[in-house]
């Protein structure tokens, strides 16, 4: 058993049929010694008496809010949550496996630049009685600070018969050095509580590996005289790290016909312009990637040829 926060405790249980469970000793937070009784949750039924109460915790019916009283007055509370371990593996019932980039990916994180700011998100089908708490650091043995905000519900989607809820959190490394080579990874830890079930999820990464630039901005077409060619120009996204001479991007320019079956013409360039042939009803799209490190491409920025 360990304390998650004040008056909230997590009991770690090996979860198998007829498991003996854990014996947990609760102590009433009071100078009183006599006449103390205990109740569980909303029940008025007395569970036991004494300044300390030993309980056998082996299933969710044994978790909940234990309250000690004296003469009708509440003295203190202890909320017990369960963390299940089945066949040596901690349960992952609360979050959905996103399976990207690999199986057992529950947390996904992205950064728009090298400033030390990043966003993580996760998915669940649970809509109520759900809380999240996020902590992060760079390194784990001598951790350097990363500050995370509160997790918020960022999207709702219908997937077949189920509703899916996306939560996200923004974090910022306290003393980020954008140009420095990373040697220690960022660690992100999410505590998830659904009713009386506790679970924790972790992710470890280097900022350089989760970079995904915003799409190029101000995408414009300039027709070239007496030609089907156009000059496409764009700018670095505002969110990208500066100076651009150091934090450089490379770009992919694509001409795509109206039909998905039509052949795509692609051009790669380090410049912020390119000359392409603009076909009727086609569109021109541009996306960006870090020039020197193959992390994710941005989403496309697009304009119609017409």
């Amino acid at each position: 058993i360990w304390e998650l926060k004040k008056d909230v405790y997590v009991v770690e249980l090996d979860w198998y049929p007829d498991a003996p469970g854990e014996m947990v000793v609760l102590t009433c937070d009071t100078p009183e010694e006599d006449g103390i009784t205990w109740t569980l949750d909303q029940s008025s039924e007395v569970l036991g008496s004494g300044k300390t109460l030993t309980i056998q915790v082996k299933e969710f019916g044994d978790a909940g809010q234990y309250t000690c009283h004296k003469g009708g007055e509440v003295l203190s509370h202890s909320l017990l949550l369960l963390h299940k371990k089945e066949d040596g593996i901690w349960s992952t019932d609360i979050l959905k496996d996103q399976k990207e980039p690999k199986n057992k990916t529950f947390l996904r994180c992205e950064a728009k630049n090298y400033s030390g700011r990043f966003t993580c998100w996760w998915l669940t089908t649970i809509s109520t009685d759900l809380t999240f708490s996020v902590k992060s650091s760079r390194g784990s043995s001598d951790p350097q600070g990363v500050t995370c905000g509160a997790a918020t519900l960022s999207a709702e989607r219908v997937r077949g018969d189920n509703k899916e809820y996306e939560y996200s959190v923004e974090c910022q490394e306290d003393s980020a050095c954008p140009a420095a080579e990373e040697s220690l990874p960022i660690e992100v830890m999410v505590d998830a509580v659904h009713k009386l079930k506790y679970e924790n999820y972790t992710s470890s990464f280097f900022i350089r590996d989760i970079i995904k630039p915003d799409p190029p901005k101000n995408l414009q077409l300039k027709p070239l005289k007496n030609s089907r060619q156009v000059e496409v120009s764009w700018e670095y996204p505002d969110t990208w790290s500066t100076p651009h001479s150091y934090f450089s991007l490379t770009f992919c320019v694509q001409v795509q016909g109206k039909s998905k079956r039509e052949k795509k013409d692609r051009v790669f360039t380090d410049k912020t312009s390119a000359t392409v042939i603009c076909r009727k009803n086609a569109s021109i799209s541009v996306r960006a990637q870090d020039r020197y490190y193959s992390s994710s491409w941005s989403e496309w920025a697009s304009v119609p040829c017409s």
Epitope: L40, E45, V46, L47, G48, I55, Q56, V57, E59, G61
Partner: nanobody, 114 residues
Framework: EVQLVESGGGLVQPGGSLRLSCAAS????????MYWLRQAPGKGLEWVST???????AYAEFVKGRFTISRDNAKNTLYLQMNNLKPEDTALYYC????????RGQGTQVTVSS
């Protein structure tokens, strides 16, 4: 009519073990929290242990891992396995349907003495 009948008490040496049983009838046993209480000579009624409907137990401080409460809903029976008994465990042990012992049996005597 609610009936609770305890058995299994007796004379035992310090460090010995006993298993108390309580046969319940006249109510839906599986729907109630059940209790073991005790009364030492010249003392008031003292709570020993509780078992919830879900089967999880709670114990008084003096028990310190020596006793185990259990229930068999199919047999309408409550149990208290008592190990490493001490002279101070000498008392009349009652099975009860409430913490105050307003609905309880006649009790079974446990004497721990060398």
């Amino acid at each position: 009519e609610v009936q609770l009948v305890e058995s299994g008490g007796g004379l035992v040496q310090p460090g010995g073990s006993l298993r108390l049983s309580c046969a319940a009838s006249g109510f839906t046993f599986s729907g109630y929290w059940m209790y073991w209480l005790r009364q030492a000579p010249g003392k008031g009624l003292e709570w020993v242990s509780t078992i919830k409907t879900t089967g999880g137990g709670a114990y008084a401080e003096f028990v310190k891992g020596r006793f185990t409460i259990s229930r068999d809903n199919a047999k309408n029976t409550l149990y208290l396995q008592m190990n490493n008994l001490k002279p101070e465990d000498t008392a009349l042990y009652y099975c009860a349907r409430d913490f105050e012992g307003t609905v309880r049996g006649q009790g079974t005597q446990v004497t721990v003495s060398s």
